[in-house]
Amino acid sequence: SEVEYRAEVGQNAYLPCFYTPAAPGNLVPVCWGKGACPVFECGNVVLRTDERDVNYWTSRYWLNGDFRKGDVSLTIENVTLADSGIYCCRIQIPGIMNDEKFNLKLVIKPAKVTPAQTAHGDSTTASPRTLTTERNGSETQTLVTLHNNNGTKISTWADEIKDSGETIRIG
């Protein structure tokens, strides 16, 4: 069964996926798709890497970790209820039927709005948690808290750039 991950509406969701590349310049193609992993490839691809680059992604999806070291964990920005569902991380190891497939279930909960909510945001167990501060008007800076593959908690500031929702394709 799928491993379950949770986030609240308006937060960033984090879906972990890792492998160990032979070298930083000798990577394995990876695809992320919405829906369970099919027999081949990924369905409804939201992000794809090749042996060197992230060569396809859509606007709210990006890699939080260093994909050159095999951290291909997916971040989905500003999630809505429609982002709920199964996601497939597929490590496309060369050879017949060698792919590693991971189905991750994302559960989006409605945002909790309470009169007692403080400037530090909601402290529920949703991952990642965010502390958002306005900066320069057009950007906000968000403290993203997540757990890496060693179980270590990581906090990092991430600029939430507001985009037009377009699809970006390289190459």
Partner: antibody, heavy 121, light 107 residues
């Protein structure tokens, strides 16, 4: 427009540690997808990639320098830093900071102006 | 690591002439080769990436070609501001490496 600016001592004594900082302005510093690199150029010679740091803190170094290099990040100041230990005269160079993006890995689209570091007693 | 050899070391031409700079890799780098321009006292500037793609804001007189081990940077008609040092760089194999440069000087 992204801008990078190197700063640090222009003179370092042999066997000591070279320390430089790169300040990034104009956005993108703490955004996933961008890698922050150090590259150097000895006088009259070609360029050599030293290493990178990703905004998550992940680092990677050129094998030829790995034992002496540390690159670190200060996201609160939009800065990343280079430390090169046990320097010799061969480390005299102009040191550049530069950016690349994971859509075109190791293609350096923005550079700082560079700072000359001389190793001499 | 991959060694990039640039030739000639120095190229002397006049404004308006065509410049052809060469970069040869010690093993195939597919099309993963970039070209940079560097003027005295300035940082390198990305001109061409992945062998033939012009970077943002680069004039059309700059073009790149080649694949595998042999690559060419061509400047169709030299402008006074084009006289500089040009470097090639590969990103096919880690670590990324640069050539030693070609100095393009006014004849």
């Amino acid at each position: 427009q992204v801008q990078l600016q190197e700063s640090g001592p222009g003179l370092v004594k042999p066997s000591e540690t070279l320390s430089l900082t790169c300040t990034v302005s104009g956005g993108s510093f703490s955004r996933g997808g961008y890698y922050w690199n150090w590259i150097r150029q000895p006088p009259g010679k070609g360029l050599e990639w030293i290493g990178y740091i990703y905004y998550s803190g992940s680092t990677n170094y050129n094998p030829s320098l790995k034992s002496r290099v540390t690159i670190s990040l200060d996201t609160s100041k939009n800065q990343f830093s280079l430390k090169l230990s046990s320097v010799t005269a061969a480390d005299t160079a102009v040191y550049y900071c530069a950016r690349d993006h994971y859509s075109s890995s190791w293609t350096f689209d923005y550079w700082g102006q560079g700072t000359l570091v001389t190793v001499s007693s | 690591e991959i060694v990039l050899t640039q030739s000639p070391a120095t190229l002397s031409l006049s404004p308006g002439e065509r410049a052809t700079l060469s970069c040869r890799a010690s093993q195939s780098v597919s099309s993963y080769l970039a070209w940079y321009q560097q003027k005295p006292g300035q940082a390198p500037r990305l001109l061409i990436y992945d062998a033939s793609n012009r970077a943002t804001g680069i004039p059309a007189r700059f073009s790149g070609s080649g694949s595998g081990t042999d690559f060419t940077l061509t400047i169709s008609s030299l402008e006074p501001e084009d006289f500089a040092v040009y470097y090639c760089q590969q990103r096919s194999n880690w670590p990324p490496t640069f050539g030693q440069g070609t100095k393009l000087e006014i004849k």
